[in-house]
């Protein structure tokens, strides 16, 4: 039977620019966590694999840094990084906890004060 | 450049074990991880497992769980399979092989080592 | 433990054909597959990962694509050199698992 569940950060925004921590955390559950997936909804970001350490996706590996722990920092954000992104937890003998971060990309301050703001 | 060069052929007995070894150069040793895969004649690809060589951590398909062991000498840069209680079907080339930087994909390769089980 | 259902087993084409091949994963494995080529007594080589990005030196008539469960590699243009056994590969979770090879041979 799973007993556990994930926390995670759940709706979360930054500044285009930016960077951000996405963070599950398992609790509830003696469970072994093996390995950890990181997903946006059709692509692979990373896995952290207990034993073999980290993979990131080519498409991610010049802004994503591992951790920190299981967590994954997603740098240089952009607007087109607005959406859900899943950290799937891969536990023994449990088997799969899933949880979902929304992340909001927004404009830096500075860019909405400059579309606000035109020097005449 | 990237360099993994395998032992050679051995030939043993059911029930023995071989020690297949695979020297890494052209690179950091411990930053990379070794994966060992196997291929019987005529038949297709098998991943036996991994080793973190910066920690000795090991990752196995359980099909070889309780008869394979993988080890690291970073003094040498090698990276060594043992496989115990062998059986006339472990006749197969065993091939070391490292990923990409972080990355999990087998982009280098060992020569092969042809392992004969036979009495 | 993940299956890949690569498809066909074997196919033969002429030079200058376009050549597609498919494997059919048994559960989601989001974008972690590779392809690899096999030539007889040699070792395989990574052609194509994740699974769109052609690795160094491969030239542009490979292909990958796919998500999910689903993934195609294609060659554009078979040429002679490309007579092979190719193999599909998830790392998404482990044991890692291949598929069971498509032997392509030249017309």
């Known amino acids: 039977m799973m007993t556990g569940t994930i926390e995670t950060t759940g709706n979360i925004s930054a500044e285009k620019g930016g960077s951000i921590i996405l963070q599950c955390h398992l609790s509830s559950t003696t469970a072994q966590v093996t390995q950890v997936n990181w997903e946006q909804q059709d692509q692979l970001l990373a896995i952290c694999n207990a034993d073999l350490g980290w993979h990131i996706s080519p498409s991610f590996k010049d802004r994503v840094a591992p951790g920190p722990g299981l967590g994954l920092t997603l740098q240089s954000l952009t607007v087109n990084d607005t959406g859900e992104y899943f950290c799937i937890y891969h536990t023994y003998p449990d088997g799969t906890y899933t949880g979902r971060i929304f992340l909001e990309v927004l404009e830096s301050s500075v860019a909405e004060h400059g579309a606000r703001f035109q020097i005449p | 450049q990237v360099q993994l060069v395998q032992s050679g052929a051995e030939v043993k007995k059911p029930g023995a074990s071989v020690k297949v070894s695979c020297k890494a150069s052209g690179y950091t040793f411990i930053s990379y991880n070794i994966y060992w895969v196997r291929q019987a004649p005529g038949q297709g690809l098998e991943w036996i497992g991994g080793?973190?060589?910066?920690?000795?951590?090991?990752n196995f398909n359980e099909n070889f769980k309780g008869r394979v062991t993988l080890t690291v000498d970073t003094s040498i840069s090698t990276a060594y399979m043992e496989l115990s209680r062998l059986r006339s079907d472990d006749t197969a080339v065993y091939y070391c092989?490292?990923?990409?930087?972080?990355?999990?994909?087998?982009?280098?390769w060992g020569q092969g080592t042809t392992v004969t089980v036979s009495s | 433990d993940i299956q890949m259902t690569q498809s066909p087993s074997s196919m033969s084409a002429s030079v200058g054909d376009r050549v597609t091949i498919t494997c059919k994963a048994s559960?989601?494995?989001?974008?972690?597959v590779a392809w690899y080529q096999q030539k007889p007594g040699k070792a395989p080589k990574l052609l194509i990962y994740?699974?769109?990005y052609r690795y160094t030196g491969v030239p542009s008539r490979f292909s990958g694509s796919g998500s999910g469960t689903d993934f195609t590699f294609t060659i554009s243009s078979v040429q002679p050199e490309d007579i092979a056994t190719y193999y599909c590969q998830q790392h998404y979770s482990t044991p890692w698992t291949f598929g069971g090879g498509t032997k392509l041979e030249i017309k």
């Open positions: 994740s699974p769109s």
């Open positions: 559960q989601h494995v989001s974008t972690a």
């Open positions: 092989t490292r990923g990409n930087y972080y990355g999990y994909e087998f982009a280098y």
């Open positions: 080793v973190n060589p910066s920690n000795g951590n090991t």
